[in-house]
Interface confidence: medium
């Protein structure tokens, strides 16, 4: 595939990344499936100032991001190491609460009003923010 | 500090245009999310356009095909557009700056009343 | 559109007691709700998000709760800069705000 030179219609590009932020709110399963839609991932963060973009165009809305520990440990979507990357969790998170009455803990990540993150249930319908790099390949055919 | 200072309003006539301006301070318009919100003469308030860091535009569906949300980067100003003015669009205009894509506004200006009426 | 319904129009209360504020949505906004303050001649002002966060520089007397449909702005103590109209604002899907409840002085 080629290149991605530049960010699709309505995507913000933000140091080599694209992001697009949802205005609806879906299940964990359903925004990662509806961003790989879009060869793209559920957002991956990876660094302060990635946190402090992010957090500047959600504001103070419950968001999920790509970080979930359904298998067991936490893990990043697109494989980023969680032991030794970036974290920004509340105090006293992820705690994999079950006193929800949901079933279950909370094996899925996301943004809070303050940015912080908490672990929640996946299936609450939270807003989320897709990501793809720029640098990667597409999925489309090259033009002949 | 941040300040946003309405301008633009005044009387005028049924099926008439005029363009609003929300001269910024204190922050960059072009890097937020801004809308206009608009107070009938005792009323409550009505969220009318709102304009993306990307520059995609959105509208109320009241509004929907006559007034355009814009801003002119150079000189830190957004601006509405309103044309085919009609007697309910009488109110007091506020600009208000977004807190975030989707969340509440954390800024407002102190309001330009425009009057729809012959 | 979520229509957003507030009650009472209009509360008349002494300085110093607590005034209840109510807000109702026509369906669920989650703990995406807003409240704003607008006094004579001032720009609105955010009180609250999250339902019950208070906004920068925002006194303590000023508490939000509820979360769904309910929701209830609480002002502890009255001060004379509190006799204003409030308005609560959900942010849910797109916004639209309450028709406001003037709080004045009894």
């Known amino acids: 595939g080629s290149e991605r030179t530049c960010c699709p219609v309505n995507w913000v590009e933000h140091e080599r990344s694209c992001y697009w932020f949802s205005r609806s709110g879906k299940a964990w399963a359903d925004a990662d499936n509806y961003c790989r839609l879009e060869d793209a991932h559920l957002v991956v963060v990876t660094s302060w100032e990635e946190q402090k973009f992010v957090q500047h165009h959600i504001g103070p809305v419950n968001t999920w991001m790509g970080l979930h520990d359904q298998n067991g440990p936490w893990k990043w979507v697109d494989g980023t190491d969680y032991e030794t990357g970036f974290k920004n969790w509340r105090p006293e998170q992820p705690d994999d609460w079950y006193g929800h009455g949901l079933g279950g803990g909370e094996d899925c990540a996301h943004f809070t009003d303050d940015g912080r993150w908490n672990d929640d249930v996946c299936q609450r319908p939270y807003r989320w923010v897709c990501e793809t790099e720029l640098d990667k390949a597409s999925q489309e055919p090259p033009l002949l | 500090e941040v300040q946003l200072v309405e301008s633009g309003g005044g009387l005028i006539q049924p099926g008439g245009s005029l363009r609003l301006s929300c001269a910024a301070s204190g922050f960059t318009v072009s890097s937020n999310y801004m809308s206009w919100v608009r107070q009938a003469p005792g009323k409550g308030l009505e969220w009318v356009s709102v304009?993306?860091?990307?520059?995609?535009?959105y509208n109320a569906d009241s509004v929907k095909g006559r007034f355009t949300i814009s801003r002119d980067n150079s000189k830190n100003t957004l601006y509405l557009q309103m044309n085919s003015l009609r007697a309910e669009d009488t109110a007091v205009y506020y600009c208000?700056?977004?807190?975030?894509?989707?969340?509440?506004?954390?800024?407002w200006g102190q309001g330009t009343l425009v009057t729809v009426s012959s | 559109e979520i229509v957003m319904t507030q009650s009472p129009a209009t509360l008349s209360v002494s300085p110093g007691e607590r005034a209840s504020l109510s807000c109702r949505s026509s369906q669920s906004v989650n703990s995406n709700l807003a409240w704003y303050q607008q006094r004579p001649g001032q720009a609105l002002r955010l009180l609250i998000y999250g339902a019950s966060i208070r906004a920068t520089d925002i006194p303590a007397r000023f508490n939000g709760s509820g979360s769904g449909t309910e929701f209830t702005l609480t002002i502890s103590s009255l001060q004379s800069e509190d006799f204003a109209v409030y308005f609560c604002?959900?942010?849910?899907?797109?916004?639209?705000f309450g028709q406001g409840t003037t709080v004045e002085i009894k």
């Open positions: 604002q959900q942010y849910n899907n797109w916004w639209t």
């Open positions: 304009i993306y860091t990307g520059g995609s535009t």
């Open positions: 208000a700056r977004n807190w975030g894509m989707a969340g509440p506004f954390d800024y």
